[in-house]
């Protein structure tokens, strides 16, 4: 007779990443008895919520419940019913909601309130919805990739379990690009972190880490594009704007009200006597790059060295995992290979941006035009941000690894967030007091 399989002793956790452009739900699973081991939690599901980011629901909060339904129902299906009540659900909102809160705390609270009420209706253990700080977003992204890469494990292995593993315990830096913000987080080499706001101290698995992190609000790819357009229309003073960041032959009408809707364009705002203007693409990488650089103020630095806008940045150290939009954009452009040099990436971008729009539409017929039209800008922006913003060089470029998933789990802040909130990263190596949430932030 066949033995009956013993019921799995596993646990689940759900994290919703409420980003500026969309919301994604992640389901994580781990063996219950190995909670404090490193590398045991893995992602079993990702569900992308149809529609925009939650900050866009400010005028239609009543639609939030329906918006979240499909993915929450998917979670109900994936997680065994017996586990529902003990499965924690966390929602973390990032820069899109940070921007909304800057405009109106009341409106941001209203959105979060409706989100909380909607999520409370499900049979899971809802733990709350909150806007996480940029510092947390950077820190949790760093924790995620290093946890998945096995960097917190004290056991040095003679074999490599992940493609990026270098068999040493040197942590990877984390580069995260969203729609509204971008984060850089790494352990500097014997360098004092000159600005306290950018310093984090962790004790994880018995080891101390002094981590540098900064989140640049308004420098996610979507908000950077709005900034660039607002800057350019100010200089152009014209109803038509030739834009080197869009393909030759591309045309798009932009509403001035949309342009000035975001706090990110406030510094460029001027009274324009027209309600709309037309972008005409001219597809020139070099000129696009030049135009993007004007968004980075590098003339002011009160520290020994800065990234841009007067923000301290220590000398880059070690390898970096570049994920989220860094990965999605570079993957689309077929530039994620470790073998592709920075010079080659630049060459490819020059060719790509110069391709006529009609040709691009034909070559990528399955891609939504809204996204397709912005890859020239996004790719150029990534290069500008990494090279001029963060001071990577042609040589240090090879230390950037564009990562989508590690061991089947998405690189991003959500896993680190859940590990922390469920106390699954102990401060000490043996079974000991777990790290409290307040230790982080």
């Amino acid at each position: 007779t066949q033995n009956k399989a013993l019921p799995e002793n596993v646990k689940y956790g759900i994290v919703l990443d409420a980003g500026s452009s969309h919301t994604s739900l992640y389901i994580y699973k781990w063996p219950a008895e190995k909670e404090n081991d490193t590398g045991v939690v893995h992602q079993v599901e990702e569900c992308r919520v149809k529609g925009p980011g939650i900050s866009k629901f400010v005028q239609k909060v009543n639609e939030i419940g329906i918006y979240l339904t499909d993915c929450m129902e998917r979670a109900r299906e994936v997680i065994p019913r017996s586990q529902h009540q003990e499965t924690p659900v966390y929602l973390g909102a990032t820069a899109g909601m940070r921007l909304l809160r800057m405009e109106s705390e009341e409106l941001a609270d209203r959105v979060l309130d409706v989100v909380e009420r909607s999520l409370s209706n499900y049979p899971f253990d809802f733990q709350g919805a909150r806007i996480i700080t940029g510092q947390e977003e950077g820190a949790y992204g760093w924790i995620t990739i290093n946890y998945l890469l096995g960097k917190f494990s004290q056991k040095t292995r003679w074999f490599s379990i992940v493609p990026y593993e270098t068999n040493n315990q040197e942590t990877f830096g984390a580069l995260d690009l969203g729609g509204a913000s971008t984060q850089v987080t790494f352990v500097p080499q014997n360098q004092t972190i000159e600005s306290p706001d950018n310093a984090l101290q962790f004790r994880l698995y018995g080891k101390d880490y002094n981590v540098y992190t900064h989140s640049f609000l308004c420098y996610g790819k979507d908000q950077a594009l709005w900034q660039k357009l607002a800057k350019d229309i100010q200089v152009a003073s014209n109803e038509i704007l030739r834009d080197p960041c869009f393909h030759p032959g591309y045309k798009k009408v932009v509403n001035v009200s949309d342009l000035y809707k975001t706090p990110c364009t406030k510094r460029f705002e001027m009274t324009l006597p027209f309600q709309q203007f037309e972008i005409q693409g001219i597809g020139n990488y070099q000129q696009c790059h030049q135009s993007i650089l004007e968004l980075f103020n590098t003339s002011y630095c009160p520290y020994s060295q800065c990234a841009f806008n007067g923000i301290f940045l220590p000398p880059l150290q070690g390898d970096f995992g570049a994920f989220s939009a860094f990965y999605f954009v570079m993957k689309f452009l077929n530039l994620t290979s470790e073998k592709v040099s920075q010079e080659k990436v630049t060459e490819m971008m020059k060719k790509f941006c110069a391709q006529p729009w009609e040709e691009i539409k034909t070559s990528y017929a399955g891609v939504k035009e809204k996204y397709l039209s912005e890859y020239c800008f996004s790719g150029t922006y990534i290069l500008s941000l990494l090279l001029q913003g963060y001071h990577f060089t042609a040589d240090s470029w090879e230390h950037i690894h564009f990562i989508g998933k590690i061991q089947g789990s998405d690189a991003g802040w959500t896993l680190g967030y859940m590990l922390n909130l469920t106390n699954m990263i102990p401060a000490e190596q043996p079974l000991s007091t777990p790290l409290s949430h307040s230790t982080y932030v």
């Epitope: 038509i240 027209f274 000129q287 003339s299």
Partner: antibody, heavy 119, light 107 residues
């Protein structure tokens, strides 16, 4: 081939008026902002006025504000500079130039037309 | 208004010589600067835009550079047709303002 041709210059008495046209060809005139720039004898270039493609944005130099009016007729591909209350210091060569950010900022200029204000 | 201070106001140089003209902006203009050449017959031609981008058809001996608020036009090896007047113009804000000009003469 892009061409800008100014005309209408001449001798005008102080306090008088004159309208300078600039005829454009070889490009989509209605897409471009247009400028008037002048140069007094033996002097440098001086920006005078600007009009956007749809005429919704207009700027003037302080020296001509209230006396000069820039306008355009997109159907006729023509730019105009109406000058009133002319003074001797308005004596100059007047140039028109086209403008379209990013790469066409004052990239083509006319050959100029001479205005002399004297009694 | 943004003042553009151009130097030198005149310059005598020989064929084959390397020359540099400079414009200094009184306020931040973020690279929004063009260089123009005016021939003795009054013809005006744009050479460089966005501080350093060479116009198509302009010889490679011309180059534009930016260092902080200083902008320069360099001609690496003078040719006879380069003797003319040169102007910089900022297009960061209105009113648009020109530098005072540089008269480049043959020595």
């Amino acid at each position: 081939e892009v061409q800008l041709v100014e005309s209408g210059g001449g001798l005008v008495k102080p306090g008088g008026s004159l309208k300078l046209p600039c005829a454009a060809s070889g490009f989509t005139f209605s897409d471009y902002g247009m400028h008037w720039v002048r140069q007094a004898p033996e002097k440098g270039l001086e920006w005078v006025a600007y009009i956007s493609s749809g005429s919704s944005i207009i700027y003037y130099a302080d020296t001509v504000k209230g006396r000069f009016t820039i306008s355009r007729d997109n159907a006729k591909n023509t730019l105009f500079l109406q000058m009133t209350s002319l003074r001797s210091e308005d004596t100059a060569m007047y140039y028109c130039a086209r403008d379209l950010y990013y790469d066409h900022v004052l990239d083509y200029w006319g050959q100029g037309t001479t205005l002399t204000v004297a009694s | 208004d943004i003042q553009m201070t151009q130097s030198p106001s005149s310059l005598s140089a020989s064929l084959g010589e390397r020359v540099s003209l400079t414009c200094r902006a009184s306020q931040e203009i973020s690279g929004y600067l063009i260089w123009l050449q005016q021939k003795p017959d009054g013809t005006i031609k744009r050479l460089i835009y966005a501080a350093s981008t060479l116009d198509s058809g302009v010889p490679k001996r011309f180059s534009g550079n930016r260092s902080g608020s200083d902008y320069s036009l360099t001609i690496s090896s003078l040719e006879s047709e380069d003797f003319a007047d040169y102007y910089c113009l900022q297009y960061a804000s209105y009113p648009r303002t020109f530098g005072g000009g540089t008269k480049l003469e043959i020595k």
